[in-house]
Interface confidence: medium
């Protein structure tokens, strides 16, 4: 889910959850598994 | 079907508190950020809060910050908003609504039909 | 705050005739190459419902009668063609910075 990372902004909260969600994406792994393997 | 219905709307005495829900049903609730906008009678809309999906992050403007407080319970696909200190110009119809996802930041997608806050002595 | 100026604050348009909306921001809602503006159509007695997000982009089930443009400061919501189940009062939203804000509306109605 997104919660992952905290900025002061909310739509720059969301750019990065977007740039995270797409590098899970590219690296082959769900991004749930990514998020919750850390 | 993706539906959201909001409950706890009321008449209330100014300096009084009440707390909304809104049950969430037909998509993985956990999964997506929510928000609270009201509309006032016969007035526009307004951004009342923002929480994250699964709940550690919050937002409001300074016009219900320290006042309102929006929480989630993703075991029961519910969201709430406590409402304390109420004021008359909170008088509104509160609408609980869905956030689209990663790359859509702000826009809501899926609406509840309201509940109605009336604040007045 | 961001102000969102709307304009006009109604509009009365023939049956098939083009209905244009504008919406200007104090301040720019882009960032990062995106442009955090969405579009909200409300019937009477009805909640809001999304029409346009990212400045442009159709959500699911809109009709292509509808677009949405612009950049920065100055955004327009076009209904093409328009019908008689668009008349409504439209909403721009900015949420790019907080506090989010909207627009104070537009009321769409049948000439």
């Known amino acids: 889910h997104s919660d992952g990372i905290f900025t002061d902004s909310y739509s720059r909260y969301r750019k990065q959850m977007a740039v995270k969600k797409y590098l899970a994406a590219v690296l082959g792994k769900r991004y749930k598994q990514r998020v919750k393997n850390k | 079907e993706v539906q959201l219905v909001e409950s706890g709307g009321g008449l209330v005495k100014p300096g009084g508190s009440l707390r909304l829900s809104c049950a969430a049903s037909g998509f993985a609730f956990n999964n997506y950020d929510m928000s609270w906008v009201r509309q006032a009678p016969g007035k526009g809309l307004e951004w009342v809060a923002t929480?994250?999906?699964?709940?550690?992050?919050?937002w409001y403007p300074d016009s219900v910050k320290g006042r309102f407080t929006i929480s989630r319970d993703n075991a029961k696909n519910s969201l709430y908003l406590q409402m304390n200190s109420l004021r008359a110009e909170d008088t509104a119809v509160y609408y609980c609504?869905?956030?689209?996802?990663?790359?859509?930041?702000?826009?809501?997608?899926?609406w509840g039909q309201g509940t109605t806050v009336t604040v007045s002595s | 705050d961001i102000v969102m100026t709307q304009s006009p604050d109604s509009l009365a348009v023939s049956l098939g005739e083009r209905a244009t909306i504008n919406c200007k921001a104090s301040q720019s809602v882009d960032y990062d190459g995106d442009s955090y503006m969405t579009w909200y159509q409300q019937k009477p007695g009805q909640p809001p419902k999304l029409l346009i997000y990212?400045?442009?982009n159709l959500d699911s089930g809109v009709p292509d009668r509808f677009s949405g443009s612009g950049s920065g400061t100055d955004f327009t919501l076009t209904i093409s063609s328009l019908q008689a189940e668009d008349v409504a009062v439209y909403y721009c939203q900015q949420s790019n910075e907080d506090p989010w804000t909207f627009g104070g509306g537009t009321k769409v109605e049948i000439k």
């Open positions: 929480i994250t999906g699964g709940g550690s992050y919050t």
């Open positions: 609504a869905r956030l689209t996802g990663y790359d859509q930041a702000g826009a809501m997608d899926y």
């Open positions: 990212a400045a442009s």
